[in-house]
C-alpha cells in the first residue's frame, strides 16, 4: 500500500509508460500512400499519453523498446475485391528522421480484407512512424476495424 | 537487489499487473452469439490474475489501459468452407454495463479460417468483455488455436 | 525525477523486463520443420535482453508470464500458391525440456501468405521455444515480414 501511494505521487511519465492508440482520420492525397491518424478522448477510445501526432503521423517522445501494433480493414471489400486489387500492402516504418528511415512491419492483403500484426522494436525520441497503404482500396474508418498503436515496454 | 526484495514483499495487485488468458469453453445456445471462456491452471496454460469470469465472460477489476488480444480458429474449416459461410465475423466489445457498451475489435474471416488481432483500450472496473462469433461455423476448442486475453498496461 | 534516477541505478534485469525480438536466420535441414532465429544490434533491429539463443531457438531465463508474438510471411507466395501448397502451418511451442513440451500457438496459411498472432503464456527459466513451419513453402527472411519475439509481462 505504501508503494502504491508513493507511485501515485510520481508523474506517470517518469515511469516511462508512454502509450498511444489511434483511429484513422483519412488517407493521404494522391501520390501520398500514408494513412493519417487522430487520437484523443473526444474522438472515442483513442488516446496519446507521451507520443504526439505531427500532421497525422505518430512521433515518439521517449527512447525505448516499443510494442507497435496495427489493424487495417479495407472498406467495401470482399475476398474477390481484395484479390482483384492485389497487391494491396500495409507497411509501418520510421519515416523521419530520414537517417533512421526503415520498414518495421509489412503485410499484404492477398484475398483477405483485414491485416493485423504487432512487433517489438527500438524507437528513439523524435522518430516518426508512418503507415503506408499502397493499392487502390480504401481503409475502413470504423474504430473497431482500423487502429494503430504503440506501447513503451522498456528502456 | 534491495528493490527486488522490496518488490516481492508487495502484493503484485498493488503494481496493477492484472492479466488473464482464457481458453474456449463452449459456444452459446442458439440466438446467443457469445463465446464462453474458461481459465485456470487446472485447465492448462490459461489463468486469471485480477480479472474474473462471470458466466464465461471476462470482467475487469482494475481501471486502466489494457492490451486486449484474441485468436479464433474455425473448426473443420478450409478456405472454401470459410468463403461459403461468409460472413463469419468475430467482435470483441464491452457488453456490460449497458451504458458503456461498445465494439472494440472486429474481424471477418473471408476466405481464412483464423483471425488474430490485438489493441489497446481503456477499461474500467466492472466492464465485462464479450466475444461474439456470428455465422454458422463453430470455433476450434484447441487451446493453441483459440484464446482470448487481456493485459493491464498502465493507469 | 528522484525515482527515475533510482531506477537507473538498478539493473533492469531486477525489474524483470526480459524481452527479445528475433529475425529469421534460416530454415532447418530436411525433416527439421524448425525455423532458426538470430538477434542482436549488429543484425539490425533485433535484440535479446534476458532470453538467449540456443542453436537458433529462444531460451527463457526468467520465470513469468510472457507475451509471445510472431509474424511469418511466405516467400514467393500468392493466394494461389498458398492454397495449392495447403496445408502450410506455423506452430510455436515449448520444445524443451521434453517434460514441458506443448504447442502454444498454431496457425494455418490457407489462402494467405502471412500469419501473425500473439498470446500470453506462463514460461519458466530453461524453457526453449521452437517455431515449426510445416509444408513445402519457404519463409521470407525480410526483417519486416518475418519476426518472433517475447516480452516478460509479470511474475
Amino acid at each position: 500500500q505504501r508503494f502504491a501511494q508513493a507511485q501515485q505521487q510520481l508523474p506517470l511519465e517518469s515511469l516511462g509508460w508512454d502509450v498511444a492508440e489511434l483511429q484513422l482520420n483519412h488517407t493521404g492525397p494522391q501520390q501520398d500512400p500514408r494513412l493519417y491518424w487522430q487520437g484523443g478522448p473526444a474522438l472515442g477510445r483513442s488516446f496519446l499519453h507521451g507520443p504526439e501526432l505531427d500532421k497525422g503521423q505518430l512521433r515518439i517522445h521517449r527512447d525505448g523498446i516499443y510494442m507497435v501494433h496495427i489493424q487495417v480493414t479495407l472498406a467495401i471489400c470482399s475476398s474477390t475485391t481484395a484479390s482483384r486489387h492485389h497487391p494491396t500492402t500495409l507497411a509501418v516504418g520510421i519515416c523521419s528522421p530520414a537517417s533512421r528511415s526503415i520498414s518495421l512491419l509489412r503485410l499484404s492483403f492477398h484475398q483477405g480484407c483485414t491485416i493485423a500484426s504487432q512487433r517489438l522494436t527500438p524507437l528513439a525520441r523524435g522518430d516518426t512512424l508512418c503507415t503506408n497503404l499502397t493499392g487502390t482500396l480504401l481503409p475502413s474508418r470504423n474504430t473497431d476495424e482500423t487502429f494503430f498503436g504503440v506501447q513503451w515496454v522498456r528502456p | 537487489q534491495r528493490f527486488a526484495q522490496a518488490q516481492q514483499q508487495l502484493p503484485l495487485e498493488s503494481l496493477g499487473w492484472d492479466v488473464a488468458e482464457l481458453q474456449l469453453n463452449h459456444t452459446g445456445p442458439q440466438q446467443d452469439p457469445r463465446l464462453y471462456w474458461q481459465g485456470g491452471p487446472a485447465l492448462g496454460r490459461s489463468f486469471l490474475h485480477g480479472p474474473e469470469l462471470d458466466k464465461g465472460q471476462l470482467r475487469i477489476h482494475r481501471d486502466g489501459i489494457y492490451m486486449v488480444h484474441i485468436q479464433v480458429t474455425l473448426a473443420i474449416c478450409s478456405s472454401t468452407t470459410a468463403s461459403r459461410h461468409h460472413p463469419t465475423t468475430l467482435a470483441v466489445g464491452i457488453c456490460s454495463p449497458a451504458s458503456r457498451s461498445i465494439s472494440l475489435l472486429r474481424l471477418s474471416f473471408h476466405q481464412g479460417c483464423t483471425i488474430a488481432s490485438q489493441r489497446l483500450t481503456p477499461l474500467a472496473r466492472g466492464d465485462t468483455l464479450c466475444t461474439n462469433l456470428t455465422g454458422t461455423l463453430l470455433p476450434s476448442r484447441n487451446t493453441d488455436e483459440t484464446f482470448f486475453g487481456v493485459q493491464w498496461v498502465r493507469p | 525525477q528522484r525515482f527515475a534516477q533510482a531506477q537507473q541505478q538498478l539493473p533492469l534485469e531486477s525489474l524483470g523486463w526480459d524481452v527479445a525480438e528475433l529475425q529469421l536466420n534460416h530454415t532447418g535441414p530436411q525433416q527439421d520443420p524448425r525455423l532458426y532465429w538470430q538477434g542482436g544490434p549488429a543484425l539490425g533491429r533485433s535484440f535479446l535482453h534476458g532470453p538467449e539463443l540456443d542453436k537458433g531457438q529462444l531460451r527463457i531465463h526468467r520465470d513469468g508470464i510472457y507475451m509471445v508474438h510472431i509474424q511469418v510471411t511466405l516467400a514467393i507466395c500468392s493466394s494461389t500458391t498458398a492454397s495449392r501448397h495447403h496445408p502450410t502451418t506455423l506452430a510455436v511451442g515449448i520444445c524443451s525440456p521434453a517434460s514441458r513440451s506443448i504447442s502454444l500457438l498454431r496457425l494455418s496459411f490457407h489462402q494467405g501468405c502471412t500469419i501473425a498472432s500473439q498470446r500470453l503464456t506462463p514460461l519458466a527459466r530453461g524453457d526453449t521455444l521452437c517455431t515449426n513451419l510445416t509444408g513445402t513453402l519457404l519463409p521470407s527472411r525480410n526483417t519486416d515480414e518475418t519476426f518472433f519475439g517475447v516480452q516478460w509481462v509479470r511474475p
Epitope: H26, T27, P29, G44, A75, I76, L138 | I102 | -
Partner: antibody
Framework: EVQLVESGGGLVQPGGSLRLSCAVS????????IHWVRQAPGKGLEWISY????????YYADSVKGRFTISRDNAKNSLYLQMNSLRDEDTAVYYC????????????WGQGTTVTVSS | DIQMTQSPSSVSASVGDRVTITCRAS??????LAWYQQKPGKAPKVLIY???SLQSGVPSRFSGSGSGTDFTLTISSLQPEDFATYYC?????????FGPGTKVDIK
C-alpha cells in the same frame, strides 16, 4: 425493410427549441454511425451533425455548433437532434441518414421532417 | 473546410444521351467522395461511394471516376427516371460538405 423515420418538426419562433427524433428499423442500429443533414427551401444539402455507434464521437457543422445536440438511444433504436436558440436560417427539411458501415457516406436516408422558424 | 464545386449547375438532355457531371474539391480528398440523386420532394439516394463503387441496386448506367480533387459522375444512357438533381459529397474530413448540385432536366 431498412427504414429511418423522422418526426418532431413543426413551426417554432426564433429563439425557440425543438427536438427531432429518428426511429430506425430493419437493421442493427448500434452497428451504424448516423448523420443529420438538412435542406433549406430551394437550396442544396447541408451536413449538420454526426454521431458514432456508441456516441463516443460527435461532430457538428459550425452553423449549429453550441445550439444543436445530437444523441442516440441504441436500446430504443432512436436518434435525436435537440435544437435550441433556433434562427430563421434553420428553416429546412431535416433528414437523418445512416452511415455506410465502413465509410463516411450516407447509404440510407429518412423521408425528412420540416422545421419552420418564423415569428 | 473543404469546398466542393460542381459543373454544370444544370444540364438539359434527352433520353439516351450520355451525361457527365464533374465535381471538384478545394483540396485532395483521395477517393472519399459520394454521389447522390434527389428528386423533388424526396430524400436523396446514394448512387456511388468511394468515388467509383456502385451502390447495390443502382443501375449500371451510372458510373463514377476520379481521385484527388477531380471527380466525374457519368450516366451512359439517360433514362426518364434519371431527371433529377445530383450532388457530390466529400467524406474526407469533418465537416462533410456537399456540392451545390447539378440539375438534369429534359431538353
Amino acid at each position: 425493410e431498412v427504414q429511418l423515420v423522422e418526426s418532431g418538426g413543426g413551426l417554432v419562433q426564433p429563439g425557440g427549441s425543438l427536438r427531432l427524433s429518428c426511429a430506425v428499423s430493419g437493421f442493427t442500429f448500434s452497428n451504424h454511425n448516423i448523420h443529420w443533414v438538412r435542406q433549406a427551401p430551394g437550396k442544396g444539402l447541408e451536413w449538420i451533425s454526426y454521431i458514432s455507434r456508441s456516441s463516443s464521437t460527435i461532430y457538428y457543422a459550425d452553423s449549429v455548433k453550441g445550439r444543436f445536440t445530437i444523441s442516440r438511444d441504441n436500446a430504443k433504436n432512436s436518434l435525436y437532434l435537440q435544437m435550441n436558440s433556433l434562427r430563421d436560417e434553420d428553416t429546412a427539411v431535416y433528414y437523418c441518414a445512416r452511415d455506410h458501415a465502413q465509410w463516411y457516406g450516407m447509404d440510407v436516408w429518412g423521408q425528412g421532417t420540416t422545421v419552420t422558424v418564423s415569428s | 473546410d473543404i469546398q466542393m464545386t460542381q459543373s454544370p449547375s444544370s444540364v438539359s438532355a434527352s433520353v439516351g444521351d450520355r451525361v457527365t457531371i464533374t465535381c471538384r474539391a478545394s483540396q485532395g480528398i483521395s477517393s472519399w467522395l459520394a454521389w447522390y440523386q434527389q428528386k423533388p420532394g424526396k430524400a436523396p439516394k446514394v448512387l456511388i461511394y468511394a468515388a467509383s463503387s456502385l451502390q447495390s441496386g443502382v443501375p449500371s448506367r451510372f458510373s463514377g471516376s476520379g481521385s484527388g480533387t477531380d471527380f466525374t459522375l457519368t450516366i451512359s444512357s439517360l433514362q426518364p427516371e434519371d431527371f433529377a438533381t445530383y450532388y457530390c459529397q466529400q467524406a474526407f474530413s469533418f465537416p462533410f460538405t456537399f456540392g451545390p448540385g447539378t440539375k438534369v432536366d429534359i431538353k
